[in-house]
């Protein structure tokens, strides 16, 4: 048995680390392998995760970590039974893919404008809160070449724009990810979408 | 309440020994890295040593490395400090203190202290 | 084996300003952990600050921690009578535990 992948890791930079490899053919990742993980501190203890299959050859495990702080380092070892298959180390804030935005919400009852709000994933004492910054998908059901992005560079976590910029009469969708800048992250999942009805008074036309 | 209380303190002569207990209320000690720290009368902060959750590793500062074995009894949840070789300057307050591993090191419960004095 | 300096030895400063104490490394600790104590007479130390920057439960947002590298800094925005004491920077590294010597805060 052997790794053909080596495991890469990615940090929430909250509570969890996900890591993935490949091995060089089909396994029962949860009776095969442990993977331990221990973070660099005098007189911390290793911790076991326990993986689950990832496809054929593939294995995840997510490592569960009690809080993050930039220092955090962390030795792995992932074994086969008493065979040490591979050692090596990850840091959690060199590798970051923040948790995806929640609980997006469409007002479409202000005057013509749409405001689109959702929450931010993190609790107020967790370093990534204030460094949010947002990107919005809006897209037609109808048209997919009706399909456009809104970069939120500000830390609110809401996005304004004209109804009338969109079709009207017509179903749209919409969706936001995430990412921070301060630690070059990756940019988190899309949050689940949410629909509305795209529905705006057209201006008189002046004779 | 999360509590530590430290006994066992007294006068000793030089090259004596004295076992120091730290009794834990409040919380489970099998859960915590714990620690041994002193203060000399007058001076500053010293760490003196300290003992993994489960008790399999341990650490010693220097200065008492070879006199001094910490241990852990986590059903009863106590820490122990066995002092041995005692000298004058071990002279101190000790504080038993416990470290959160989410606080990265920080020691967020002190004891009040046990005083240790080694004098003939 | 890394040795913690602060500056002032001692700091005096009146209710209402702001205190700046220092922690200097005598080597780089990208991978360990800063944290900062205040111990009043007769006292065992309180946790202020850890990992650098985080305060601890309860502590007021008038504690600030900063720093990397090897400076360290704890800022005290605006002073309180009950902030005048001794503060002590303690590095918790993979392999040692050290305090520095420690910095008195007196009321001018």
């Known amino acids: 048995m052997k790794v053909l992948q080596e495991p890469t890791c990615v940090s929430d930079y909250m509570s969890i680390s996900t890591c993935e490899w490949k091995m060089n053919g089909p396994t029962n990742c949860s009776t095969e392998l442990r993977l331990l993980y221990q973070l660099v501190f005098l007189l911390s203890e290793a911790h076991t995760c326990i993986p689950e299959n990832n496809g054929g050859a593939g294995c995840v495990c997510h490592l569960l970590m009690d809080d993050v702080v930039s220092a955090d380092n962390y030795t792995l070892d992932l074994w086969a039974g008493q065979q040490l298959l591979w050692k090596g180390s990850f840091k959690p804030s060199e590798h970051v893919k923040p948790r995806a935005p929640g609980n997006l919400t469409v007002h479409t009852n202000v005057s013509d404008t749409l405001l689109l709000t959702w929450s931010n994933p993190y609790p107020p004492d967790n370093y990534l809160y204030n460094h949010l910054t947002y990107a919005v998908n809006i897209w037609s059901e109808n048209d997919p070449a009706d399909f456009r992005i809104y970069n939120v560079t500000y830390l609110e976590p809401s996005l304004r724009i004209a109804a009338s910029t969109l079709k009207s009469g017509i179903s749209y969708r919409a969706r936001v990810r995430a990412w921070a800048q301060c630690y070059n992250t990756t940019w988190s999942e899309w949050s689940p979408s949410t629909k509305w009805h795209n529905s705006y008074r057209e201006p008189f036309e002046q004779h | 309440e999360v509590q530590l209380l430290e006994s066992g303190g007294g006068l000793v002569q030089p090259g004596g020994s004295l076992r120091l207990s730290c009794a834990a209320s409040?919380?489970?000690?099998?859960?915590?890295?714990m620690h041994w720290v002193r203060q000399a009368p007058g001076k500053g902060l010293e760490y003196v040593s300290g003992?993994?959750?489960?008790?399999?590793?341990?650490y010693y500062a220097n200065s008492v490395k070879g006199r001094f074995t910490i241990s852990r009894d986590n059903p009863k949840n106590t820490l122990f400090l066995q002092m041995s070789s005692l000298r004058a300057e071990d002279t101190a307050v000790y504080y038993c203190?416990?470290?959160?591993?989410?606080?990265?090191?920080?020691?967020?419960?002190w004891g009040q202290g046990t005083t240790v004095t080694v004098s003939s | 084996e890394i040795v913690l300096t602060q500056s002032p030895g001692t700091l005096s400063l009146s209710p209402g300003e702001r205190a700046t104490l220092s922690c200097r490394a005598s080597?780089?600790?990208?991978?360990?952990?800063l944290a900062w104590y205040q111990q009043k007479p007769g006292q065992a130390p309180r946790l202020l600050i850890y990992?650098?920057?985080r305060r601890a439960t309860g502590i007021p947002d008038r504690f600030s921690g900063s720093g990397s590298g090897t400076d360290f800094t704890l800022t005290i925005s605006r002073l309180e009578p009950e902030d005048f004491a001794v503060y002590y920077c303690?590095?918790?590294?993979?392999?040692?535990?050290?305090f520095g010597q420690g910095t008195k805060l007196e009321i001018k």
């Open positions: 990992g650098t920057s």
């Open positions: 203190v416990r470290v959160k591993v989410k606080y990265r090191g920080g020691m967020d419960v």
């Open positions: 080597q780089g600790i990208s991978s360990a952990y």
């Open positions: 003992i993994s959750p489960s008790g399999v590793s341990t």
């Open positions: 303690q590095l918790y590294g993979a392999t040692s535990v050290t």
């Open positions: 409040g919380f489970t000690l099998s859960s915590y890295a």
